[in-house]
């Protein structure tokens, strides 16, 4: 989701934003801070065994508004907050993993637990 | 236009600290990062660090770290580096620049001359 | 830290004739975002370093289209087709992809 009220459509800045980057930190990076003509970012999402992982980091202004749009995905649970406000906004975001949604699939007479699959999309 | 105005010259004696200013106009002074940079006869540019007046923000060269303190005064659009412990190495011209993704003002330069 | 590498370090021409200088990187300049990151400033004696072109190719406003950048990654280089008497001075090729950012050590483009 987009904090601060921004609007959806991405808008090129002036200036390099700076951001915190933790499990995302590109090779331009340097002391853990990251350099964007974008977002910056702090994502929770499951790994495959369903410990909560945090992530954060830079996104680029290409494809960030979809990004940052938090679209649900089945099967996945994660989340994730961008910002633009200041350098090393991301720092204060602190997204939740949504609501666990188990939804049972009968398959004759036994019952299957829908196992989550994890796609990263950075 | 875009202007960045600094003192033409400073002399200064070894040991003693020195604060350059560079003031700016002609544009939003918060929508862009203000850095620094060191020209040495013969040994080229050298980027100080850089300073985002809309956060205060600053990164350094490591280099730097130590000798140079930068700030800004948003009210007058002007911007500051400190400099501490001068030594004959820190005499050269001191610009600032305003930096976006790239510099693309320059001032006209305070030439720093460290002398006993 | 990135090292920018200048050739030549002295360019003698005669007006009217193109000018070729050449900038590599240490290590590759296309930043994270997608953007190259690799400026050129020309500056003349007693004078601050003035904007050519921006991001390998983008000739800054006022700069007349004699210049142009060009290159990729690691390797770049400045041309001015005609030379005329007020392109003389110091070229630097500059990167801001890798903090600190680093300069070249410059070409003095000078007559022949």
């Known amino acids: 989701k987009k904090e601060d009220g921004e609007s959806t459509a991405p808008t090129a800045r002036p200036k390099v934003l700076r951001c915190k980057c933790h499990h995302h930190c590109p090779e331009d990076s340097v002391n853990n801070i990251c350099s964007t003509d974008g977002y910056c970012f702090t994502m929770i999402e499951e790994d495959d065994s369903g410990t909560p992982v945090v992530t954060s980091g830079c996104l680029g202004l290409e494809g960030s508004d979809f990004q940052c749009r938090d679209t649900p995905i089945p099967h996945q649970r994660r989340s994730i907050e961008c910002c633009t406000e200041r350098n090393e906004c991301n720092k204060d975001l602190h997204p939740t993993l949504p609501p666990l949604k188990d939804r049972d699939f009968v398959d004759g007479p036994i019952h299957h637990k829908h196992h989550h699959h994890h796609h990263h999309h950075h | 236009q875009v202007q960045l105005q600094q003192p033409g010259a400073e002399v200064v004696r070894p040991g003693a600290s020195l604060k350059l200013s560079c003031k700016a106009s002609?544009?939003?002074?918060?929508?862009?990062?203000m850095q620094w940079i060191k020209q040495r006869p013969g040994q080229g540019l050298e980027w100080i660090g850089e300073i985002d007046p809309s956060d205060n923000y600053t990164m350094y060269n490591q280099k730097f770290k130590g000798k140079a303190t930068l700030t800004v005064d948003t009210s007058s659009s002007t911007a500051y580096m400190q400099l501490s412990s001068l030594t004959s190495e820190d005499s050269a011209v001191y610009f600032c620049a305003r930096f976006g993704f790239y510099v693309d003002y320059w001032g006209q330069g305070t030439t720093l001359t460290v002398s006993s | 830290d990135v090292v920018m590498t200048q050739t030549p370090l002295s360019l003698p021409v005669s007006l009217g004739d193109q000018a070729s200088i050449s900038c590599r990187s240490s290590q590759s300049l296309v930043h994270s975002t997608g953007n190259t990151y690799l400026h050129w400033y020309l500056q003349k004696p007693g004078q601050s370093p003035n904007l050519l072109i921006y991001?390998?190719?983008n000739r800054f406003s006022g700069v007349p289209d004699r210049f142009s950048g060009s290159g990729s990654g690691t390797d770049f280089t400045l041309k001015i087709s005609r030379v005329e008497a007020e392109d003389l001075g110091v070229y630097f090729c500059?990167?801001?992809?890798?903090?600190?950012?680093?300069f070249g050590s410059g070409t003095k483009l000078e007559i022949k």
């Open positions: 991001k390998v190719s």
């Open positions: 002609g544009y939003t002074f918060t929508s862009y990062w």
């Open positions: 500059s990167q801001s992809t890798h903090v600190p950012f680093t």
